[in-house]
């Protein structure tokens, strides 16, 4: 999906109002310095591409993020403010249903959510030069 036509300011507002808090709740009890940020993004569409991938694509050691509240709200924000996004997710949803696992918070999931926090922060500062 091409995130170029999303309403970035509305997505930013949703992030600042709630998704950020849900991410913090998920990470509660974890030191902010515990994980190094290894995933980066260069502009808002790229950030949303990376955010979608990390939030919804199961990875080795972390298959359970899609059912978290921050993930549901992320998906809603993309569906509401990115024209045509929902239509692109139908096939992905069918695949997800086949491999859904019960929610388990692993260290790998905490690391992944830490990466997500970094991507969202970058999304909110689009004018900053890439380090």
């Amino acid at each position: 999906y091409d995130f170029t036509n999303c309403d970035f300011e509305k997505i930013k507002a949703a992030y600042l109002s709630t998704i950020s808090k849900d991410l913090i709740t998920y990470m509660s009890g974890t030191k902010s310095t515990e994980f190094n940020n290894t995933v980066s993004c260069s502009n808002r569409p790229h950030c949303l591409t990376e955010i979608q991938s990390l939030t919804f694509n199961p990875t080795a050691g972390c298959a359970s993020l899609a059912k978290e509240m921050f993930a549901m709200k992320t998906k809603a924000a993309l569906a509401i403010w990115c024209p045509g996004y929902s239509e692109t997710q139908i096939n992905a949803t069918q695949a997800m249903k086949k491999r859904r696992k019960r929610k388990v918070t692993t260290n790998k999931c905490l690391e992944q959510v830490s990466q997500l926090q970094g991507l969202w922060r970058r999304f909110n500062r689009p004018l900053l030069k890439q380090q």
Epitope: A13, A14, S17, T18, I80, S86
Partner: nanobody, 117 residues
Framework: EVQLVESGGGLVQPGGSLRLSCAAS????????MGWFRQAPGKERELVTA????????YYADSVKGRFTISADNSKNTAYLQMNSLKPEDTAVYYC??????????WGQGTLVTVSS
């Protein structure tokens, strides 16, 4: 002050249908995303569906896709949730929210939906 009032809940048999309504006052309806959350006993609150009345874009949780339909009537300042093919696992208190990220002051009091034979 924003007020959201849900109605339409009740007891229904599995496979049955219900239509929930959310009447809003104190806000310009078409400029806000309207959402429905639900909370089953002993479970976390879940975002079920949301609609942007201005763009007519919608979100549905995977668990309700194809069974639930959200709509909005800007002239009546009301959002609707049509629930078909109801399952026992749909039993919950359903809450309407102005903007799916809104704080507690922008929530209704909830309406109970019970799916049981």
């Amino acid at each position: 002050e924003v007020q959201l009032v849900e109605s339409g809940g009740g007891l229904v048999q599995p496979g049955g249908s219900l239509r929930l309504s959310c009447a809003a006052s104190g806000l310009t309806f078409g400029t806000h995303v309207m959402g429905w959350f639900r909370q089953a006993p002993g479970k976390e609150r879940e975002l079920v569906t949301a609609i942007n009345p201005a763009a007519l874009t919608t979100y549905y949780a995977d668990s309700v896709k194809g069974r639930f339909t959200i709509s909005a009537d800007n002239s009546k300042n009301t959002a609707y949730l049509q629930m078909n093919s109801l399952k026992p696992e749909d039993t919950a208190v359903y809450y309407c929210a102005r903007d799916f990220w809104s704080a507690g002051d922008s929530w209704g009091q909830g309406t109970l939906v019970t799916v049981s034979s």
